[in-house]
């Protein structure tokens, strides 16, 4: 039960996180005009990864896309790449994790296969979250650097336009969305990896040596430890399982009252 809960929660947390990463990537408010020096401006600027916008006090908003690739700063391109990689990995991770969910039965898929898929999706979520956090952090660092640059002729960090009057930009809402979303995806990935450990059956099954006596059967492990004693007629070919530590989920797979772990 605990494994299913951990896996399910990991999936949901990752799903929310990836949705947040997608939202952050699409948002226009990666950087917003700093109003500290000019709180009475009638024109407000904000910028995203894909376009820059100007909102006039009268209510009109005009957005212009960055229609150049080569003219954009390398850092912006890097941030875009990190966010897209994060989204792609996250989306694949979600797809894989859907089939890995313990509560979903697909044909005769074994627990070991589900465990591997859970681990794969978990790792993908972790990398996806790290990509998002890295992308947002690189952008934030770019903003901080530009904020303190005193030169008038500087990149605004977006369109590479030369400014005649320095407009300073500060952290936009998308940065915080990105950080939180990346963190959630990371946590979801870790949860999936933890769930994977509970799903995976250990491969160290001992071969039991059975000694048959008339009337009853006593099976011994090589170490001489008495593993199981069975009474009654159904004692032929009794098999001893040593699957290591098991959760409640696995116990249900072995219903016989004579099978002790």
């Amino acid at each position: 039960m605990a494994v299913t809960a951990c896996q399910g929660l990991g999936f949901v947390v990752s799903l929310i996180g990836i949705a947040g990463i997608i939202a952050a990537t699409c948002m226009d408010q990666w950087s917003t005009q700093d109003l500290y020096n000019n709180p009475v401006t009638a024109v407000f600027n904000y910028q995203g990864l894909w376009r820059s916008c100007v909102r006039e006090s009268s209510g009109f908003t005009e957005c212009r896309g960055y229609f150049t690739l080569l003219g954009l700063p390398a850092m912006l391109q890097a941030v875009r790449a990190l966010m897209i990689v994060g989204i792609v990995l996250g989306a694949i991770g979600l797809l894989v994790s859907i089939f890995a969910l313990k509560c979903i039965r697909i044909g005769s898929m074994e627990d070991s296969a589900k465990a591997n898929m859970t681990l794969t999706s978990g790792i993908m979520f972790i990398v996806s979250g790290l990509c998002a956090i890295a992308g947002v952090s690189v952008f934030a660092n770019m903003l901080v650097t530009n904020f303190w640059m005193s030169t008038a002729n500087m990149y605004t960090g977006m369109g590479g336009m030369v400014q005649t009057v320095q407009t300073r930009y500060t952290f936009g809402a998308a940065l915080f969305v990105g950080w939180v979303a990346g963190g959630l995806t990371l946590i979801g990935g870790v949860m999936m990896c933890i769930a994977c450990r509970g799903l995976a059956p250990e491969e160290t099954n001992y071969k039991a040596v059975s000694y048959h006596a008339s009337g009853h059967s006593v099976a011994y492990k090589p170490g001489g430890f008495k593993a199981s004693t069975g009474f009654g007629s159904n004692t032929k070919n009794k098999k001893i399982y040593d699957g290591g530590a098991r959760t409640e989920d696995e116990v249900q797979s072995y219903p016989s009252k004579h099978d002790y772990v």
Epitope: E56, S58, G59, R64
Partner: antibody
Framework: QVQLQESGPGLVKPSETLSLTCTVS????????VSWIRQPPGKGLEWIGV???????NYHSTLISRVTISVDTSKNQFSLKLSSVTAADTAVYYC???????????WGQGTLVTVSS | DIVMTQSPDSLAVSLGERATMSCKSS????????????LTWYQQKPGQPPKLLIY???TRESGVPDRFSGSGSGTDFTLTISSLQAEDVAVYYC?????????FGGGTKLEIK
Amino acid sequence: QVQLQESGPGLVKPSETLSLTCTVSGFSLTSYGVSWIRQPPGKGLEWIGVIWGDGSTNYHSTLISRVTISVDTSKNQFSLKLSSVTAADTAVYYCARAGRGNALDYWGQGTLVTVSS
Amino acid sequence: DIVMTQSPDSLAVSLGERATMSCKSSQSLLNSGNQKNYLTWYQQKPGQPPKLLIYWASTRESGVPDRFSGSGSGTDFTLTISSLQAEDVAVYYCQNDYSFPLTFGGGTKLEIK
């Protein structure tokens, strides 16, 4: 079409409060801002303040302590209140809609307010 | 506050001739975000409210004759009437639409010579 019409008393006594109303039609009050501008006889234009579609206001720094601009969306009306008036506040008062570029694209005909005892 | 200074105070031009007036702001009106100058020109005829001519320093309002044109950037702006008509006799005002308070210039009175 877009229309703005100022109304209010033409004569106000010194130290009293000047109250004017701008009734508008042809546009959404929540989508545009409305500015108040005045023009003393024979002089230039002076911007008083503005109320934006979201209800926020900005006032001229020299008048900020005396002026209040508000909106009544149910009546499609904007109001201007200017307290403690003096003879220097005698002017034609205009209301105008703020459009693209924050420019005032539609103006009312204006109403003359005289401050005199 | 941004101070808007218009020159000349008064201008006399013959019909059909070019009329040019200037407006200077104490601070730049250029917005780096969209590379637009938030300067507006108005025309006011006697006994009438002002009429919007040009916004963003050079964009003509719809219905305004194309003989009116605006130019300039940053702090220096110009309104040009390419061929003066009798109905262009008026006072012309420039306004800062970039920073509050949205101050007006003192105006340029245009007359026929």
